[in-house]
């Protein structure tokens, strides 16, 4: 079945942008001016997910790349990774659970909770130039709130 998708950028609540750091990692840092063109453009898709009051299940792919954010166990710890997929088959309505994030919107701020690992969130560090990761705490030092901006083609 076809899915509703959009193109967007994400910034954390400290206004750090997300950029590629090597082929399979994202990092967060402050960008200005022309450097803003470095930020990753996501293709966010509305997918099938479990019932929950005001959580909306989405998948986060990298626009025009066959890479999706996914959540897997590594050394017994929930971990965020960029995973290659077959572009002929993605995005799809029934994404595998590791690709699904519950988007939670509160006061124009977005959180992305892993569907595979409840209460684990896409997170950034306070420090500059650090990897985007899956964090198991909210409201602590690490940042779990993001803002979204559509990207004009």
């Amino acid at each position: 079945a076809p899915v509703r998708s959009l193109n967007c950028t994400l910034r954390d609540s400290q206004q750090k942008s997300l950029v590629m750091s090597g082929p399979y990692e994202l990092k967060a840092l402050h960008l200005q001016g022309q450097d803003m063109e470095q930020q990753v453009v996501f293709s966010m898709s509305f997918v099938q997910g479990e019932e929950s009051n005001d959580k909306i299940p989405v998948a986060l792919g990298l626009k025009e790349k066959n890479l999706y954010l996914s959540c897997v166990l590594k050394d017994d710890k929930p971990t965020l990774q960029l995973e290659s997929v077959d572009p002929k088959n993605y995005p799809k309505k029934k994404m595998e659970k590791r690709f699904v994030f519950n988007k939670i919107e509160i006061n124009n701020k977005l959180e992305f909770e892993s569907a595979q690992f409840p209460n684990w969130y896409i997170s950034t560090s306070q420090a500059e130039n650090m990897p985007v990761f899956l964090g198991g705490t909210k409201g602590g030092q690490d940042i779990t709130d993001f803002t979204m901006q559509f990207v004009s083609s």
Epitope: E51, N53, K93, E105, N108, F150
Partner: antibody, heavy 119, light 108 residues
Framework: EVQLVESGGGLVQPGGSLRLSCTVS????????MSWVRQAPGKGLEWIGI???????YYASWAKGRFTISKDTSKNTLYLQMNSLRAEDTAVYFC?????????????WGQGTTVTVSS | DIVMTQSPSTLSASVGDRVTITCQAS??????LSWYQQKPGKAPKLLIY???TLASGVPSRFSGSGSGAEFTLTISSLQPDDFATYYC??????????FGQGTKLEIK
């Protein structure tokens, strides 16, 4: 305060074209999706389509081809281009804001602009 | 496309009555259903989203229930301000967003 104001309605001949506008304030079109919905006289609500970014628009099957949704974020304005108009397109046209991305429901509406297709 | 069917089309009731409006989807839409109220000459107003969550500022006499393909809107004790037309809306069943045909709630 969230406000949406439609304009551009009026009388148009069958086969003609019309572009409706919806100017918004109190929020940004760069982070909210917008729909157009219409209501023929004495009839129910009919969803036309929705726009996210300028490359991501989705339409009701009956609207594809004749109706085009676009926006100018810098002007806080949403548009509905309607071509090859027919008598059955006579309706009040509303713009509406999606409450959250992909929520599908609409928490802010304009007052509507009336389009009459008649010779 | 998913088709939304409301019943009844018209409902006559009195102030203080408990009323229920039903909405059926042609296939499962999980809990992706909203309800709107519309008064003559006005824009619709969001009442309930995700089948059962009350929108901001909506009185608690309104409630929604259901999932899958069967949904209901209940007004526990009708007030004079509640006489209007009510619409259900599929908000998540694929690409298309669809409204029911409406239920007109009128004074008996």
């Amino acid at each position: 305060e969230v406000q949406l104001v439609e304009s551009g309605g009026g009388l148009v001949q069958p086969g003609g074209s019309l572009r409706l506008s919806c100017t918004v304030s109190g929020f940004s079109l760069s982070s909210y999706a917008m729909s157009w919905v219409r209501q023929a006289p004495g009839k129910g609500l009919e969803w036309i389509g929705i726009i996210y970014d300028s490359a991501s628009t989705y339409y009701a099957s009956w609207a594809k081809g004749r109706f085009t949704i676009s926006k100018d974020t810098s002007k806080n304005t949403l548009y509905l281009q309607m071509n090859s108009l027919r008598a059955e397109d006579t309706a009040v046209y509303f713009c509406a804001r999606e409450r959250q991305i992909f929520s599908g429901d609409m928490d802010g509406w304009g007052q509507g602009t009336t389009v009459t297709v008649s010779s | 496309d998913i088709v939304m069917t409301q019943s009844p089309s018209t409902l006559s009731a009195s102030v203080g009555d408990r009323v229920t409006i039903t909405c059926q989807a042609s296939q499962s839409i999980s809990s992706y259903l909203s309800w709107y109220q519309q008064k003559p000459g006005k824009a619709p107003k969001l009442l309930i989203y995700r089948a059962s969550t009350l929108a901001s500022g909506v009185p608690s006499r309104f409630s929604g229930s259901g999932s899958g393909a069967e949904f209901t809107l209940t007004i526990s004790s009708l007030q004079p301000d509640d006489f209007a037309t009510y619409y259900c809306q599929n908000t998540g069943g694929g690409i298309n967003i669809a409204f029911g045909q409406g239920t007109k709630l009128e004074i008996k």
